[in-house]
Interface confidence: medium
């Protein structure tokens, strides 16, 4: 009875582990659309994965209601500043819900990174990290937006990313 009980416990633990939704999405060459839409993400290659969450056009889609820790980091950088750039850059995580017609702000940060360029070096770097626990219902979606996305540096999938896991 002992070994069978242990086996059952192991199966139970594994089952509960498997259904705990989690995802980590990484920046890719296709992330920046230039269309004003949310950033797009790699879902399979390298460090990226989806488990118990789905993905659609930049959005993580919740299949199981609960409390989720959601997070995103974007690497910002440039040579000087693009003309017409807003004085602040907004990086945000936004919720889409069938119950409301517009995206809802969940976590937002604002930077003024272009001030980091100096007369001796026009190259500058900055980053923005957002993370927090929110309640999400099944069918709700979370997206990342950056205004101005021209400043997001992608490269190898480790600098800019987006993820969530149920807590």
């Amino acid at each position: 009875d002992g070994p069978a009980g242990s086996w059952e416990q192991l199966i139970q633990e594994r089952r509960s582990h498997e259904v705990n939704p989690a995802a980590h999405l990484t920046g890719a060459n296709s992330s920046l659309t230039g269309s004003g839409g949310p950033l797009l993400w790699e879902t399979q290659l390298g460090l990226a994965f989806l488990r118990g969450l789905s993905y659609h056009d930049g959005a993580l889609v919740v299949t199981k209601a609960g409390y989720y820790y959601i997070y995103s980091k974007v690497q910002l950088g440039g040579v000087g500043c693009p003309l017409g750039l807003a004085s602040t850059i907004t990086h945000g995580l936004y919720k889409r819900t069938p119950r409301y017609p517009e995206e809802l702000e969940l976590l937002v940060s604002q930077q003024s990174p272009c001030g980091r360029a100096t007369s001796s070096s026009r190259v500058w770097w900055d980053s923005s990290f957002l993370g927090g626990v929110v309640h999400l219902e099944a069918g709700e979606e979370v997206v990342v937006r950056v205004l101005d996305e021209r400043l997001v540096r992608l490269r190898d999938g480790t600098r800019s990313y987006f993820g969530a896991f149920m807590v």
């Epitope: 040579v79 000087g80 693009p82 017409g84």
Partner: antibody, heavy 121, light 111 residues
């Protein structure tokens, strides 16, 4: 399709000013910079400056700062380049060009047909 | 200002042969793995036309016989098989910092 249509040729006397227009169509006017580049007869290309029609921000080549003024009229999707205190060496074809971005790097993907400005006494 | 120097000033190549134009910047125009260098073609009486942006990206609608390469300060525009319609002046341009500057141009002719 994207089009930039410039005003016609001008002949000006030294010391005068000239205002060249560039009417944009086929894209969201307020989303792209418009640059101005000139080319003296038989010579190469020289960047004058740029304007962002979304908010009127400008950037100038120091060589032209104080003499060149770039403006944008959102209501007509038109950008203007005014050059004052003209001298004979300002005789050139003046081009407007749309600036597109690859990250923070700007390149000129559509050009106007050019406007010949002749400065002669 | 960043000075752009092209070589040669003119080039005569047989139809179907390879044409190579070089451009040297007075300082590096690289940032984060990208080279802020663009190439344009200008035919007589016409405005310049974008061929290559960010050193190696082919502009939409440009024939794939055109290619760009290089990094840092040294860049190359290659026409793999010269066609009659490729007779023009070619300019490199840096967009690393303003004032954006152009090379003096390279005239390509048919031998």
């Amino acid at each position: 399709q994207v089009q930039l249509v410039q005003s016609g040729a001008e002949v000006k006397k030294p010391g005068a000013s000239v205002k060249v227009s560039c009417k944009a169509s086929g894209y969201t006017f307020t989303s792209y910079n418009v640059h101005w580049v000139r080319q003296a007869p038989g010579q190469g290309l020289e960047w004058i400056g740029a304007v962002y029609p979304g908010n009127g921000d400008t950037s100038y080549n120091q060589k032209f700062k104080g003499r060149a003024t770039l403006t944008a009229d959102k209501s007509t999707s038109t950008v203007y380049m005014e050059l004052s205190s003209l001298r004979s060496e300002d005789t050139a074809v003046y081009y407007c060009a749309r600036g597109s971005y690859y990250y923070t790097s700007s390149y000129f993907d559509h050009w106007g047909q050019g406007t010949l400005v002749t400065v002669s006494s | 200002d960043i000075v752009m120097t092209q070589s040669p000033d003119s080039l005569a190549v047989s139809l179907g042969e390879r044409a190579t134009i070089n451009c040297k910047a007075s300082q590096s125009v690289d940032f984060d793995g990208d080279s802020y260098m663009n190439w344009y073609q200008q035919k007589p009486g016409q405005p310049p036309k974008l061929l290559i942006y960010t050193a190696s990206n082919l502009e939409s609608g440009v024939p794939d016989r055109f290619s760009g390469s290089g990094s840092g300060t040294d860049f190359t525009l290659t026409i793999s098989s010269l066609q009659a319609e490729d007779v023009a002046v070619y300019y490199c341009q840096q967009s690393y910092e303003d004032p954006f500057t152009f090379g003096q141009g390279t005239k390509v002719e048919i031998k």
